[in-house]
C-alpha cells in the first residue's frame, strides 16, 4: 500500500481517522514540512515575549523580548533583563559598576578603566561608570619646555575669561 501521507503538503496533516486525507492544520497550529501526521502547536509570545512574526499554517510564530529585555538562546527562548549604562547584570539584578570600572552598554559586565600609564600616557578625561577614561599625551609631553607640534596659545591678559 502506498503511503498517501507523503503527498500531504506543509500546512496540512495526514488524518488517519479519515483514510489518510490531508486535512488543514487546525487554528493555532502549523506543519512546516510535508507528510506530517500531526500539526505542532504554535508558540505563544506573551509576558516578556512579544510577537515578531505571527504563526501561519506552515511556520511557527517568532518571538522577541519586550522593551527592557533582550533575547537569549535559540529562537529567543529566553528574555534577559537589560541594565542601564553604568551597570552590570548580576545574579541579583542590575548593580552599579564599582569605582574604576565602566559599562557603556545595556548588557555585559563592567570593565576596568584603561590604565593610561601603561602606554606612557596621562589621563585626559576621567572615567565614569558609563565611560572609559580618555588617555592623552604622555606626562613628558605636557611638561614645561617640551617641544610641541602646535604653537603655544597666546597669553591672556589677567582678568579676562576665555572666549
Amino acid at each position: 500500500l502506498q503511503d498517501l501521507c507523503s503527498n500531504c503538503p506543509a500546512g496540512t496533516f495526514c488524518d488517519n481517522n479519515r483514510s489518510q486525507i490531508c486535512s488543514p492544520c487546525p487554528p493555532n497550529s502549523f506543519s512546516s514540512a510535508g507528510g506530517q501526521r500531526t500539526c505542532d502547536i504554535c508558540r505563544q509570545c506573551k509576558g516578556v515575549f512579544k510577537t515578531r512574526k505571527e504563526c501561519s499554517s506552515t511556520s511557527n510564530a517568532e518571538c522577541d523580548c519586550i522593551s527592557g529585555y533582550h533575547c537569549l538562546g535559540a529562537e529567543c527562548s529566553m528574555c534577559e533583563q537589560d541594565c542601564k549604562q553604568g551597570q552590570e547584570l548580576t545574579k541579583k539584578g542590575c548593580k552599579d559598576c564599582c569605582f574604576g570600572t565602566f559599562n557603556d552598554q545595556k548588557r555585559g559586565i563592567c570593565r576596568p578603566w584603561t590604565n593610561c600609564s601603561l602606554d606612557g600616557k596621562s589621563v585626559l578625561v576621567n572615567g565614569t561608570k558609563e565611560r572609559d577614561v580618555v588617555c592623552g599625551p604622555s606626562p613628558a609631553d605636557l611638561s614645561p619646555g617640551a617641544s610641541s607640534a602646535t604653537p603655544p596659545a597666546p597669553a591672556r591678559e589677567p582678568g579676562h575669561s576665555p572666549q
Epitope: 552590570e88 548580576t90 545574579k91 541579583k92
Partner: nanobody, 124 residues
C-alpha cells in the same frame, strides 16, 4: 559540542517536591561551576542557585533559600536541583547553565552555555 540536557520537570501540587537533573557533555564537567536559572511565564530570567566545580560551595537566591538544594555528581556529569515546599510562584521553565570558571558566588553572572529548559508547573 557542549550540551546540557535537563529533565525532571512536570506538574506538582503546592507543597510538593520535584528533583531536576541536568546531564552535561562536551566539556570537563568538574572544572566548571554550574547554575540553575528560571523564567516564569510572565517574567524575565531569574537566577536560582549556583554550585562550584567541586561542589564545595553553593549559593541560593533569597526566594528559594531553605527550600531548594543544588548538588552535583561529577562522576556522572550531572547537576541536580531538589525542590521542596513548592508554591505557584515557582512555576517556570528551569534552565541548567554552565558558568565560565570553576569558582562561583552569588554575584557574578558568568553564564556561557544554556540547556533547553524543563517546565515546572505548580498547581492544584
Amino acid at each position: 559540542e557542549v550540551q546540557l540536557l535537563e529533565s525532571g520537570g512536570g506538574l506538582v501540587q503546592p507543597g510538593g517536591s520535584l528533583r531536576l537533573s541536568c546531564t552535561a557533555s562536551g566539556f570537563t564537567f568538574s572544572n566548571y561551576a554550574m547554575s540553575w536559572v528560571r523564567q516564569a511565564p510572565e517574567k524575565g530570567l531569574e537566577w536560582v542557585s549556583s554550585i562550584s566545580g567541586s561542589g564545595g560551595s553553593t549559593f541560593y537566591a533569597d526566594s528559594v533559600k531553605g527550600r531548594f538544594t543544588i548538588s552535583r555528581d561529577n562522576s556522572k556529569n550531572t547537576l541536580y536541583l531538589q525542590m521542596n515546599r513548592l508554591t505557584a510562584e515557582d512555576t517556570a521553565v528551569y534552565y541548567c547553565a554552565k558558568e565560565g570558571s570553576n569558582g562561583t558566588d552569588d554575584y557574578h553572572y558568568d553564564i556561557d552555555v544554556w540547556g533547553q529548559g524543563t517546565t515546572v508547573t505548580v498547581s492544584s
